[in-house]
């Protein structure tokens, strides 16, 4: 007896009869930048404050007839999805609406900027609890809109935006492409990407996660008790804004980085049929559907990590790609991936006082991606130890030699174009898990971290015969921090983390003879923090 | 999600020093850039967001806006300052002819200029 979308985001423990999770986001204020709204609709009456902010362009067309209920349609529905009495996600959240979209649902980058500035000034004048800003709109890529979002996010505001309804790479749109914003794609009742006419949800590495966005029942501006179904990435973003409000109400001190990691962690994994996405976007698009956490507390003990893909490097010989973590996150490992298999590896390097992950294209390569593993590790002290190419035939190796430092990731980078083509695999000597091993022509980089209670272990999975994909996963209670391929397999396209699984991809097996060179080994570094677990037990 | 990518047009105008000296050259070594939406139907030429360098104060933003208006007037162009930004980004929103872009890019404190564009409900 509840709408499918509310059931979908609700963990089983709340599903007894009705959707009634505890504490409906009452400590949080959600700002909505959208059309005008019907604030006396029963779903939202008394919980949405219409601000006096309005910055909209004139409607197109001389014969446009401004009908109140149509002008309010989009915003009213979204306000209802976020905080509606009956069909809302965060039934206790209070909202403030700013009108930046006209009766045709059209606005401007400049109007949105002025709206964001209005929110920042309001926050300074009257500081309240946690703020969530919902931006259910999209335009072309805009440097200035992304910059404004970055500034607002760094002022402690959580921004949630629609990925866009253009069946396209979300990185081509703003604010969807802003790294600091939580960007949400849309899925349907079958957990499939939403199709909207000839278009549909956007996808790609700029999407953080998906959420219900098709046939979403919500407040209709047609009448004060009416409901209507609407679809789009706006509806999906509204779900995530509601979930964020719930999480922040339960834990008001959560930072943006912590919130994003929790949203990812509690999402349903690997339920989306990736065949809907263009082939080149499948690996980049997160297979995550948002859900509420099963309980309001107890997540603090977890070591949270996420995978961040860079933009494509482009095909030039010296092209590089850089993946960055958020300011509050630690880069615990760095890997690379190339569809052609022609790459020169990757390295962790300092940039502006922070480690970044840089991948290098090779001559004749179509380009590379850098893949950063970004984690929340309080009081961490991480450094990169590098070993230059070795002369010895045993290959290059490097370990974490500082007292109390553990290995969280391995990277290798080489200057030669045809590394390892005719060389046998180099195997890690047993009993030395705290070191990285690589080709003798490669420089090897070990990510070594010290943090209270941090412990890590190496897990390998090798397949002797050629395989397009080899995976190794960390067990329950452990979090994947590093993912790499054991050297010696020249046909490896790269390695990357998907949730808690390390994936090593190889060239199409039909093009690889089943020689010893066909052996592929995936190496995962799995970590956990006893300190975080103890701290959470003490809280409880 | 990266700030610096996207199917995105960046027009870096290599500025010649042929101006009449009324505009101070930007701090040496930095060239202000012009950006516009890659999706042509979404462009809104005639309105521009002038973004100033990060630490620019409100008074400097207002002064830069007035300076642009004065220099535009000398060339016979009408401009209108629609909004002065402060709190998030320093800068201002100006309604002006695209002919004035080269002039605006030479103003002191200018980091980049972006042509306004449309956004849509999703």
């Amino acid at each position: 007896s509840i709408p499918w979308n509310l059931e979908r985001i609700t963990p089983p423990r709340y599903r007894a009869d009705e959707y009634q999770p505890p504490d409906g986001g009452s400590l949080v204020e959600v700002y909505l930048l959208d059309t005008s709204i019907q604030s006396d609709h029963r779903e939202i009456e008394g919980r949405v404050m219409v601000t006096d902010f309005e910055n909209v362009p004139e409607e197109d067309g001389t014969r446009f007839h401004r009908q109140a209920s149509k002008c309010d349609s989009h915003g009213t529905h979204l306000a209802g999805v976020v905080s509606g009495r009956d069909a809302g996600v965060a039934k206790g959240a209070s909202m403030r609406s700013l009108r930046v979209l006209n009766c045709q649902g059209k606005g401007t980058v400049s109007g949105t900027l002025i709206g964001l500035e209005f929110i920042r000034k309001s926050q300074l004048v009257q500081p309240v609890g946690p703020l969530v800003v919902l931006l259910p709109l999209a335009g072309g890529y805009s440097r200035v809109l992304n910059a404004a979002c970055q500034r607002l996010a760094r002022a402690g505001v959580v921004l949630v935006t629609a990925a866009g309804n253009f069946r396209d790479d979300a990185c081509l749109y703003s604010p969807a492409s802003a790294p600091e914003v939580i960007t949400v794609g849309a899925t349907n009742a079958q957990d499939q990407p939403v199709t909207l006419g000839t278009l549909g949800t956007n996808f790609g590495r700029c999407v953080d996660l998906f959420a219900p966005g098709e046939d979403i029942i919500g407040a209709s501006s047609d009448c004060s008790t009416c409901f209507v179904s609407q679809s789009g990435t706006s509806q999906a973003a509204a779900h995530v804004a509601g979930i964020a409000a719930m999480m922040l109400s339960a834990e008001p001190e959560l930072t943006l980085a912590e919130l994003r990691q929790r949203l990812i962690h509690f999402s349903a994994k690997d339920v989306i049929n990736e065949a809907w996405f263009p082939e080149d976007q499948r690996v980049l698009t997160p297979n995550l559907v948002a859900a509420l956490p099963p309980s309001t507390h107890g997540a603090g003990w977890q070591l949270f990590c996420r995978t961040v893909w860079s933009a494509h490097s482009g095909p030039t010989r010296m092209a590089t790609a850089v993946a960055r973590c958020a300011p509050d996150e630690e880069l615990l490992s760095c890997s690379s991936f190339s569809r052609s298999g022609k790459r020169r590896g990757e390295r962790m390097e300092a940039q502006g006082g922070k480690l970044v992950c840089r991948a290098h294209n090779a001559f004749g390569g179509e380009g590379v991606y850098a893949i950063a593993r970004c984690c929340l590790l309080p009081q961490a002290n991480c450094s990169v130890h590098t070993a230059p190419p070795a002369e010895a035939s045993m290959g290059t190796r490097v370990h974490c030699h500082q007292q109390g430092h553990v290995l969280t990731g391995c990277s290798s980078h080489w200057e030669v174009e045809d590394l390892g083509t005719h060389k046998p695999p180099v195997l890690r000597p047993r009993g030395q898990p705290n070191q990285c091993v690589g080709h003798r022509e490669a420089s090897i980089h070990a990510s070594c971290c010290h943090a209270p209670g941090l412990e890590c272990k190496v897990k390998e999975h090798g397949i002797p015969a050629p395989q397009e994909q080899v995976t190794v996963a960390c067990e329950e209670g452990w979090t994947l921090t590093g993912c790499s391929a054991l050297p010696g397999t020249s046909h490896v396209l790269g390695a990357y983390a998907v949730d808690n699984t390390c994936v090593v991809r190889s060239r199409d097996v039909s093009t690889t003879g089943s020689t010893s060179e066909g052996a592929v080994t995936a190496v995962a570094i799995c970590c956990r923090s006893r300190h975080l677990a103890q701290a959470s037990q003490e809280l409880q | 999600q990266e700030d610096e990518d996207g199917d995105y047009e960046e027009l870096v105008l290599a500025l010649r020093s042929e101006e009449d000296g009324l505009a101070e050259a930007p701090e040496h070594g930095t060239t202000a850039t012009f950006h516009r939406c890659a999706k042509d139907p979404w462009r809104l030429p005639g309105t521009y967001v002038v973004v100033l360098k990060e630490e620019t104060h409100l008074s400097q933003s207002e002064r830069t806006a007035r300076r642009l208006q004065a220099q535009a007037a000398r060339r016979g162009y009408l401009t209108k300052i629609l909004h002065v930004f402060h709190g998030l980004l320093p800068g201002f929103l100006v309604k002006m002819s695209g002919d004035l872009l080269e002039l605006a890019l030479k103003l002191p404190h200018v980091d980049y200029i972006e042509e306004d564009s449309s956004v849509f409900a999703q």
């Epitope: 047609d222 009416c226 409901f227 | -």
Partner: antibody, heavy 126, light 106 residues
């Protein structure tokens, strides 16, 4: 079959608080599909909606009565109640409780009032 | 608030005749209008909802029409049990009822 039954004092003094309870039988009050409403009818006059509540206790009141009205719900007893403060003779009416389909679950039926209780007359007099 | 004005206040007709009741809204209520029947000593009963849809169990002689501000309830051939008071109600904005039309036997 769902039935609603109003109960409470038939006589209230001016300036006091009118209190009525509606007991729902033949169905559960704890459903997202419905709102539970109070409507009144002064003798020989038309109907006036007072306010509504859902099983979660979320209320929605007539703006003209909002300052005086409190509606509450007790799901364990399958009841909802009305309190109207500072009453005057103008509040003398037959008070009805009724179910209203919320519209959230379209299958629940049309978004209007029905069924109704049989009504209880409350007289405000000293 | 939206005011609903019903006319006539009283309609005197004989069984078998056609009854036409009018309800006018002070502003558009789109099609969000219902008709109720109330007999003496009883609670109202829903007849027509969303301007023209018959509620469950309501005979076909009852029909509703109109949208925006002007609405009509028609009883094609009055039966003895149809003599009662009829109210219109809108839900475009909050809930308001009309003053009622009494259909009495002539």
């Amino acid at each position: 079959q769902l039935q609603l039954q109003e109960s409470g004092p038939g006589l209230v003094k001016p300036s006091e608080t009118l209190s009525l309870t509606c007991t729902v039988s033949g169905g559960s009050i704890s459903s997202a599909s419905y709102y539970w409403s109070w409507i009144r009818q002064p003798p020989g006059k038309g109907l006036e909606w007072i306010g509504s509540i859902n099983y979660r206790g979320s209320t929605y009141y007539n703006p003209s009565l909002k300052s005086r009205v409190t509606i509450s719900v007790d799901t364990s007893k399958n009841q909802f109640s009305l309190k109207l403060s500072s009453v005057t003779a103008a509040d003398t009416a037959v008070y009805y409780c009724a179910r209203e389909n919320s519209g959230v679950v379209p299958a629940a039926g049309p978004n209007w009032f029905g069924p109704w209780g049989q009504g209880t007359l409350v007289t405000v007099s000293s | 608030e939206i005011v609903l004005t019903q006319s006539p206040a009283t309609l005197s007709l004989s069984p078998g005749e056609r009854a036409t009741l009018s309800c006018r809204a002070s502003q558009s209520v789109s099609s969000y209008l219902a008709w109720y029947q109330q007999k003496p000593g009883q609670a109202p009963r829903l007849l027509i909802y969303d301007a023209s849809n018959r509620a469950t169990g309501i005979p076909a002689r009852f029909s509703g029409s109109g949208s925006g501000t002007d609405f009509t309830l028609t009883i094609s051939s009055l039966e003895p049990e149809d003599f009662a008071v009829y109210y219109c109600q809108q839900r475009r904005n909050w809930f308001t009822f009309g003053g009622g039309t009494k259909v009495e036997i002539k």
